[in-house]
């Protein structure tokens, strides 16, 4: 019961963070501009991965895709790539999670096979969510060290007629989605290891076997099979001291030679 | 790189109007947002007014709302500055600038130049 339990909650979990994580990739703010310290403007700057954003004060909102893909930041391609992985992995994750659920019956699966998908999906969670925090993170110190990098810039040139001075951006609510969803996602897969763990069947290689008061007549039988283990018939046809055990099967008694006389 | 090209500076009387032009030379002029800023004599540059992609939000410094008016055909791969009501402090050399991502009001976010147009005020 508590496999199962963990195994279903391992999957909920796994899949809010999933969906958090195609959330956090498909929002626009990942960065938002820095409103300490500039100057009063009617317009609030944002973007994403996928696309820039202008808002003006009124709320009407105008957007823009990055059209180009050779042009873009080697970085924003990296975490890019880090989120759509986390996404892939993920899904196919709970595509295998759905399978091997406890509670779901389909067919004669095994409890071994259950195990393994169990594993698989777990591991493929965890992966899912460390891409979703990787990509998450190094966006986050991008802006960072462009932060710093614009702070800078806002003191150098003072003696010329041209101030390079830049926005500066922070982080957006998508960060946090992502560095949440991504945690989750990773608990998640977690759970489905742990929950694999107690799927995974005892080996067990013994026959069930009745015992019998044996009688004062101690009978030879040819060919016969060591009752106390299922392996291994008697290839050399060796009689056998049977010592008054039966297995199930060996019930029932058959006539022999002797039986004529 | 996209290629900017300021036109239509020059001398005008106090309260008289003039229109600037910036012409660009790429094709993709669509997915600039675009942005006026000039520099009077012996001063800093000075941010005007600013527009993005589609020209749906126009942004304009506190010292010419009202007064000047930013617009941009997409077609044409041209933006204007359209200047009513002109006063001798308005006298400075305009620059045309653009940039991929953001509507600001800071010189450094704008990556691409004109070589800018001189506009005189006279009183």
């Known amino acids: 019961m508590a496999v199962t339990a963990c195994q279903g909650l391992g999957f909920v979990v796994s899949l809010i963070g999933i969906a958090g994580i195609i959330a956090a990739t498909c929002m626009d703010q990942w960065s938002t501009q820095d409103l300490y310290n500039n100057p009063v403007t009617a317009v609030f700057n944002y973007q994403g991965l996928w696309r820039s954003c202008v808002r003006e004060s009124s709320g009407f909102t105008e957007c823009r895709g990055y059209f180009t893909l050779l042009g873009l930041p080697a970085m924003l391609q990296a975490v890019r790539a880090l989120m759509i992985v986390g996404i892939v992995l993920g899904a196919i994750g709970l595509l295998v999670s759905i399978f091997a659920l406890k509670c779901i019956r389909i067919g004669s699966m095994e409890d071994s096979a259950k195990a393994n998908m169990t594993l698989t999906s777990g591991i493929m969670f965890i992966v899912s969510g460390l891409c979703a925090i990787a990509g998450v993170s190094v966006f986050a110190n991008m802006l960072v060290t462009n932060f710093w990098m614009s702070t800078a810039n806002m003191y150098t040139g003072m003696g010329g007629m041209v101030q390079t001075v830049q926005t500066r951006y922070t982080f957006g609510a998508a960060l946090f989605v992502g560095w949440v969803a991504g945690g989750l996602t990773l608990i998640g897969g977690v759970m489905m290891c742990i929950a694999c763990r107690g799927l995974a069947p005892e080996e067990t290689n013994y026959k069930a076997v009745s015992y019998h008061a044996s009688g004062h007549s101690v009978a030879y039988k040819p060919g016969g099979f060591k009752a106390s283990t299922g392996f291994g018939s008697n290839t050399k046809n060796k009689k056998i001291y049977d010592g008054g055990a039966r297995t199930e099967d060996e019930v029932q008694s058959y006539p022999s030679k002797h039986d004529y006389v | 790189q996209v290629q900017l090209v300021e036109s239509g500076g020059g001398l005008v009387q106090t309260g008289g109007s003039l229109r600037l032009s910036c012409a660009a030379s790429?094709?993709?002029?669509?997915?600039?947002?675009m942005g006026w800023f000039r520099q009077a004599p012996g001063k800093g540059l000075e941010w005007v007014a600013g527009i993005t992609w589609s020209g749906g939000i126009k942004d304009y410094a506190d010292s010419v709302k009202g007064r000047f008016t930013i617009a941009r055909d997409n077609a044409k791969n041209t933006v204007y500055l359209q200047m009513n009501s002109l006063k001798p402090e308005d006298a400075a050399i305009y620059y045309c600038?653009?940039?991929?991502?953001?509507?600001?009001?800071?010189?450094?976010?704008?990556?691409?130049w004109g070589q800018g147009t001189q506009v005189t005020v006279s009183s």
């Open positions: 790429d094709s993709t002029f669509s997915s600039y947002i």
């Open positions: 600038a653009a940039n991929a991502i953001q509507l600001t009001r800071r010189s450094g976010d704008y990556a691409y």
